[in-house]
Interface confidence: low
Amino acid sequence: KKVVLGKKGDTVELTCTASQKKSIQFHWKNSNQIKILGNQGSFLTKGPSKLNDRADSRRSLWDQGNFPLIIKNLKIEDSDTYICEVEDQKEEVQLLVFGLTANSDTHLLQGQSLTLTLESPPGSSPSVQCRSPRGKNIQGGKTLSVSQLELQDSGTWTCTVLQNQKKVEFKIDIVVLAFQKASSIVYKKEGEQVEFSFPLAFTVEKLTGSGELWWQAERASSSKSWITFDLKNKEVSVKRVTQDPKLQMGKKLPLHLTLPQALPQYAGSGNLTLALEAKTGKLHQEVNLVVMRATQLQKNLTCEVWGPTSPKLMLSLKLENKEAKVSKREKAVWVLNPEAGMWQCLLSDSGQVLLESNIKVLPTWSTPVQP
């Protein structure tokens, strides 16, 4: 008996050939002897099978002695032995239909689990192997699970189902919903405008949901909601915003926030969450703001930074074109009785300058100038 594997939703063509190369009487039946289709002269006739309008043939091939059974939009329950009766002979074809589906949705949040479920006909014992877009292979039986989805898992998953030494391949497109970056840090001098951007790592035709930016200022004892917004078909509308700071938000994607000016009291960490319609869970992106201030008070020149800096960052004060007068792995440095000239405050990481603020120290009888 010939075995043919089919995919749920696809079309399969079961062949039946007569020795005479001409159109003769034929019909296809299932294992219950219920007629599916046949011919009446040059007309196709249908029996009372549940295949209904999904069964067809190719009349153009009948004159060549070929009488295929075409089944469209295959269902698992179409798995059966199909019998072609032609010229007093019977040709039997066993059709096994498999389906492979993602647990709930093919759009999943980063960190969620992907479960692929194989639908198979009773009595079959298939094996499945799937290859992720990043080349990871997983094997299983009826279900295959991948926990903690990563951004790199977005793309086409190719799964091969093996049964009776025959195989059928499924391709499932998975979209991992996430921000492009899990975390970002912005370095600004006091008074500068701050731009926060939250680009998404996926594109969908319609994107609807709501979001919020919670902010934990370094100086504050608790976090505060700075802004809440809605997203409708990729259009952003602000619902509520604090008066201090008064953030501004772009109306289009990518999500874009503007802080009018960097101030020490705003330095800290924020968490932007985005809840998408019809999705459980939220997308998260952390954003950090580091603010630098250089001041001269009487005989003391001070440079300070606020916000989440790593212990390996170096803060330095130096006179322009000279060696650093002071360098420390701390958040404040100062120089007493600084010489007149242009002083630079530098925040650096392994020699790379992250943030720089200049302050002009005038001779002692003048007041300092901050460019």
């Epitope: 007309f43 196709l44 006739t45 067809d56």
Partner: antibody
Framework: QVQLVQSGAEVKKPGASVKVSCKAS????????ISWVRQAPGQGLEWMGE????????YYNEKFKGRVTNTRDTSTSTVYMELSSLRSEDTAVYYC???????????WGQGTLVTVSS | DIVMTQSPDSLAVSLGERATINCKAS??????????MNWYQQKPGQPPKLLIY???NLESGVPQRFSGSGSGTDFTLTISSLQAEDVAVYYC?????????FGGGTKVEIK
């Protein structure tokens, strides 16, 4: 717009045959299944069978098998339903109806009253 | 064949009041997450008109006061606020298995 226009009322004697036509317009004729549904006076709706205008293949309700024949003429976008060996209980309004997805009937003809009386 | 049983046979409701019609199938009409149940309205001398398809989807152009619910074997058509033009006979119909079968109808009148 989609229209299904049926032939006029018929009076037949028991044992005779009747052939009702349904002319389709406003869409691709071969793309949708046409069903026949009948309704006896003061009664409910009963599906008789359907025809696939593309292939001409038909499927009938077991109750009417052997008595009903559906045909089509693609040149005039017309479907025909012939019911033979008429009896008095076949007196009904016969409707043609076009399916949407699956067997739900979105568009209907105006109906043809067939009266079987001796 | 799947037998469809509608209740009540007739229903008298005041204008602006809610009307509820029930339909029970002799076996489940669910398949692959959908319920293959449709509802029609028929006025005297007219062909039936499709109102609701796949249990709860409103056909284009049908007023929002009509809604459908249910799954498996038990289904309901609700008219939230009956209008004079809603006086008609309402039929349920399953479209899962051939032959498609209809309920016996429910006549809705104004009290």
């Amino acid at each position: 717009q989609v229209q299904l226009v049926q032939s006029g009322a018929e009076v037949k004697k028991p044992g005779a045959s009747v052939k009702v036509s349904c002319k389709a317009s406003g869409y691709t004729f071969t793309a949708y299944v046409i069903s026949w549904v009948r309704q006896a006076p003061g009664q409910g709706l009963e599906w008789m069978g359907e025809i696939y205008p593309g292939s001409g293949s038909s499927y009938y309700n077991e109750k009417f098998k052997g008595r009903v024949t559906n045909t089509r003429d693609t040149s005039t976008s017309t479907v025909y339903m012939e019911l033979s060996s008429l009896r008095s209980e076949d007196t009904a309004v016969y409707y043609c109806a076009r399916s949407g997805d699956g067997s739900r009937f979105v568009y209907w003809g105006q109906g043809t009253l067939v009266t079987v009386s001796s | 064949d799947i037998v469809m049983t509608q209740s009540p046979d007739s229903l008298a409701v005041s204008l602006g009041e809610r009307a509820t019609i029930n339909c029970k199938a002799s076996q489940s009409v669910d398949y692959d997450g959908d319920s293959y149940m449709n509802w029609y309205q028929q006025k005297p001398g007219q062909p039936p008109k499709l109102l609701i398809y796949v249990a709860s989807n409103l056909e284009s152009g049908v007023p929002q006061r009509f809604s459908g619910s249910g799954s498996g074997t038990d289904f309901t058509l609700t008219i939230s606020s009956l209008q004079a033009e809603d006086v008609a006979v309402y039929y349920c119909q399953q479209s899962l298995q051939d032959p498609p079968t209809f309920g016996g109808g429910t006549k809705v009148e104004i009290k």
